[in-house]
């Protein structure tokens, strides 16, 4: 690395990967290993972080980027740049304190994580349940009651789910 | 910074003690929950321990009995005080923030086995 020149300040000559070592006379240095600068100009290069524990390497630290991490099996992220993990529950549970609970009949989770959710109301919208609801899945809903009489033809596709509320606990 | 310290671990024969230190820094100790956890290479990473903020503890049903947690806050320690250890309590053992449910690892790691 050239030592910069500038008539301001040396140091805003240093890329992103290099820091300003005042040690060396304000010369442009690369970041020590497991270390990191993703913008230039900077005195001293950040330490990487470390994927250990429940945390796996989801991106590897480079010299001018950190390391980005996700969850071991049976946890997802939680928190911006996944600053925790959240145990994992099964389709048809919610996680509350006392850990992973079957949905409350009328309610619905079709994934790991998150909260039980009430079956559309397919009468809203005018229509019937064409297929039931369980833990896992919402119900569907089909024509509505009228469509059914006789002479009525085509079966109208399900109305997207509503925004949902919390599930009662 | 967070900074999670862990140490303590070693090898000790079944039914013997150890007791796991975690030096913790970066954040303001006092107010967080921590805890411990332990990953043995190919299974799911356990829960083990948690003491909330004013000291109350909470243990997996398989340590209950047996390991015993505690935090110092004047030096921002969490221990983890393991008697009766069996084989199975051999892993990888973290200093945890939060709670039972939701938390993250941010230290190295110290290993415990359980050997004869």
């Known amino acids: 690395f050239e030592r910069t020149r500038s008539l301001q300040d040396p140091c805003s000559n240093c890329p992103a990967g290099t820091f300003c070592d005042n040690n060396r006379n304000q010369i442009c240095s690369p970041c020590p290993p497991n270390s990191f600068s993703s913008a230039g100009g900077q005195r001293t290069c950040d330490i990487c972080r470390q994927c250990k524990g429940v945390f796996r390497t989801r991106k590897e630290c480079s010299s001018t980027s950190n390391a980005e991490c996700d969850c071991t099996p049976g946890f997802h992220c939680l928190g911006a740049g996944c600053s925790m993990c959240e145990q994992d529950c099964k389709q048809g549970q919610e996680l509350t304190k006392k850990g992973c609970k079957d949905c409350c009949f009328g309610t619905f989770n079709d994934q790991k994580r998150g909260i039980c959710r009430p079956w559309t109301n397919c009468s809203l919208d005018g229509k019937s349940v064409l297929v039931n609801g369980t833990k896992e899945r919402d119900v569907v809903c089909g024509p509505s009651p009228a469509d059914l009489s006789p002479g009525a033809s085509s079966v109208t596709p399900p109305a997207p789910a509503r925004e949902p509320g919390h599930s009662p606990q | 910074q967070v900074q999670l310290v862990e140490s303590g671990g070693g090898l000790v024969q079944p039914g013997g003690s150890l007791r796991l230190s975690c030096v913790a820094s970066?954040?303001?100790?006092?107010?967080?929950?921590m805890g411990w956890g332990r990953q043995v290479p190919g299974k799911e990473f356990e829960w083990v321990s948690g003491?909330?903020?004013?000291?109350?503890?909470d243990y997996a049903d398989s340590v209950k009995g047996r390991f015993t947690i505690s935090r110092d806050n004047a030096k921002n320690t969490v221990y983890l005080e393991m008697n009766s250890l069996k084989s199975e309590d051999t892993a990888e053992y973290y200093c945890?923030?939060?709670?039972?449910?939701?938390?993250?690892?941010w230290g190295q790691g110290t290993q415990v086995t359980v050997s004869s």
């Open positions: 945890l923030i939060g709670g039972r449910w939701s938390f993250g690892t």
């Open positions: 970066g954040f303001v100790f006092s107010t967080v929950t």
């Open positions: 003491v909330s903020s004013e000291g109350i503890t």
